[in-house]
Each structure stands twice: as C-alpha cells, then as structure tokens.
C-alpha cells in the first residue's frame, strides 16, 4: 500500500533541459499499467501511462518506458517553468493502486548547454524482489508506451 | 476495509470557531486526497474543498475560503477541518469523503459517517 | 460554477416501477458525471460514475447515460430498499457540484 514515510525525491533542473526517472515495481506488476503522473490537491493527475496511446499529441514531453524486469523509466523533456511541481509513479497492480515514487521537480533558469538529469528511485529495495527471475521479463509491445 | 471515521456531534455559539475530525483507516493514508461536503436543509450538498494528505496543498471551495481551513496530521492519519466565525447558516452535518483512486477524481466512494454541527444561541 | 439542475424534486412509486431523473449541467461536463443514493440516517452511497459506470457491488436495474449537458439516472426496477435521496454531482471542474436531490418514496 505505497512506501510509508518515503520523502519525495527532490529534483532541480534548467529550463530546457530534460530529467530521467526510474522507477521499481515488484515483478508480479510486470503486466499493471504504469503510470506518470502530476500531483494536485484532487490526486495524481496522469500525464503518460504504459498503455499504448495512438492519440498522444505530437508536442507532447513526457515519455514512459517499461524497461521490464522491475523497471520503469519516465523522460521529461524540453524543461519548461510550468513544470515545477511533484510528480510520481504509480502502478495499478495486483495489491490495488500504488505510489512507487515521488519527485519535486525545482526549474531553475536556463543553462548555456542542455543536459539530462538522471534520477533514481528510493522505491528501488523497498519493491525489490528476492524470488524474481534474473533475467529481465521484457514485456510485450503493447505494455511499453509510444512516443 | 477503507474507513473514515468522523468525531462527534457539536452544539457550539454564534461566533466561535469549531474543529472536525476524520480519521481514516483500512489504506495509505497518505495515498489519497480528502474532501469535505456540507449537507444542509436550505442547500443540498456542497463540496467545500479538498486537502492533499501527503503534501497538504489545498484547493477551496470560493465559497467556503476564510469559512473553513483544511490540515492533515500524516502521523496520525487524520484530516481536520476548522469552520470559524459560526452562525445558524453553518449548521449542517459536515462530510469528509474519499475518492476510489490515487489519481485526481472528485467523486466519492467512501464517506465518513457525517458529524452534525449545530450552531444555537 | 456549474449549475446541476436535478428534476423531479419529489417521486412517489409503486415498487416494480420504473423510475427516471434528470440532471442537466449549465456548461458541458464532459462525462464526468457520479450519481448518489442517501437513505435516510446515512452517508451518501456511489452508484454511478463516469455518466454510465455502475460502481461496484451496485445492482444492475441502477443505469446512467448521458454526455456533455444532458444525464438521466433510471432505476429500471424499483423495489422498497430504494427509499432513499438521489444527487447526481459534477467532477469535471472545480468547484465540485451536486444537484439539489429527487426524494424517492414508495407508495
């Protein structure tokens, strides 16, 4: 039921610039929808998910990869102001809806040469699990999400 | 199971200030946003606002802006409201209520058990 | 604020009947309509979101349908538990709005 007491993730990164996130699901979500989305006081506002979305517009700067294998990976791209804010993972898995992680995403002013800002996930020991395969489970291609 | 758990009733004067609770249980507390309705007589229902029980941001109601002031104790997974300035037009049994999903939905699937405010000279 | 204008305000009966409400909202809502039933002494319950979805657990003679400004609530089969207070309440913008209640009674 989410990581207890877990604190966000705090992230700072220049307007233009891109940030990638990973996210650890437990390997029985390796077939739940994944989903990126933007905290408000109503809840998490999704913004991408795993599912496959051929309506997804063509300016859009938030991209979500299920790597497999306990991964998720989340691109946000062409930084702008307006992105600050907290973000999270979340699965819809077998235990019901989780949080995986979360970010406080900082935009500072723009930098002289653009860069990605990798992040990790805390969630990573806490969803880690020890009965899993060692090898990676790739997930089919309608599971991973479409630029 | 999810339970939301209201205190009790109160019979308060014109002019004080009074606060609710709503205790919530059977989930992660801190995964959900609450909502506050308030059922009146004159008024059917009203949403009032909700309060983000993890980083306590706030959205209102305009109506109830400098009437009712939403806070959350994380550690003891309970959400609060305080109504000030009291009159006969704020009696009403007040509602928290939760929404059946982490992601942002404003309908409720789970209500507390309502705590009756009655405002009398 | 979205208005939602809810009729009849009162509908008295006769259990097997087949019962019908009306809410229209005074912008466009999308179909992001829910439907309450408040029996007397209780909490609201959910009965329907999203304009048609039956909640869980909820019996299948409680319908929704509608879009954008026009939603109607049925109970193709009323049977004496259906007592009860009926909202049907917007979520698509803030502030978050119900209509002012039918009050069903059987006869």
């Known amino acids: 039921q989410g990581i207890v007491g877990s604190l966000p993730e705090v992230l700072q990164a220049p307007v233009g610039s891109s940030i990638l996130v990973q996210c650890h699901y437990r390997l029985q979500d390796v077939k739940a929808q994944k989903v990126w989305c933007r905290f408000l006081p109503e809840g998490c506002q999704p913004l991408v998910s795993s599912a496959v979305d051929r309506r997804a517009p063509a300016g859009r700067r938030t991209f979500l990869t299920d790597l497999g294998g306990g991964l998720l990976q989340v691109e946000m791209v062409t930084l702008q102001e307006e992105d600050a804010g907290e973000y999270g993972c979340m699965v819809d898995g077998a235990r019901g809806p989780q949080i995986l992680h979360r970010v406080s995403l900082n935009i500072l002013p723009p930098e002289e040469e653009e860069e990605t800002h990798k992040i990790g996930s805390l969630a990573e020991n806490a969803f880690s699990d020890p009965a899993g395969s060692a090898n990676p489970l790739e997930p089919s291609q309608d599971e991973k999400s479409i630029p | 199971q999810v339970q939301l758990e209201q205190s009790g009733a109160e019979l308060v004067r014109p002019g004080v200030s009074v606060k609710i609770s709503c205790k919530g249980s059977g989930y992660t507390f801190t995964d959900y946003s609450m909502h506050w309705v308030k059922q009146s007589h004159a008024k059917s229902l009203e949403w009032i606002g909700v309060?983000?029980?993890?980083?306590?941001?706030?959205r209102y109601n305009q109506k109830f802006k400098g009437k009712a002031t939403m806070t959350v104790d994380k550690s003891s997974s309970t959400a609060y409201m305080a109504l000030a300035r009291l009159t006969s037009e704020d009696s009403a049994i007040y509602y928290c209520?939760?929404?059946?999903?982490?992601?942002?939905?404003?309908?409720?699937?789970?209500w507390g058990q309502g705590t009756l405010v009655t405002v009398s000279a | 604020s979205i208005v939602m204008t809810q009729t009849p305000k009162f509908l008295l009966v006769s259990a097997g009947d087949r019962v019908t409400i009306t809410c229209k909202a005074s912008?466009?809502?999308?179909?992001?309509v829910a439907w309450y039933q408040q029996k007397p002494g209780q909490s609201p319950k959910l009965l329907i979101n999203?304009?048609?979805s039956r909640y869980t657990g909820i019996p299948d003679r409680f319908t929704g349908s509608g879009y954008g400004t026009d939603f109607t609530f049925t109970i193709s089969t009323v049977q004496a538990e259906d007592l009860a207070v009926y909202f049907c309440q917007q979520d698509y913008s803030s502030p978050y709005t119900f209509g002012g209640g039918t009050k069903l009674e059987i006869e």
């Open positions: 912008q466009s809502v999308s179909n992001d």
């Open positions: 209520a939760r929404a059946p999903m982490i992601t942002t939905g404003a309908w409720f699937a789970y």
């Open positions: 999203y304009a048609s």
């Open positions: 309060i983000s029980t993890y980083y306590g941001d706030v």
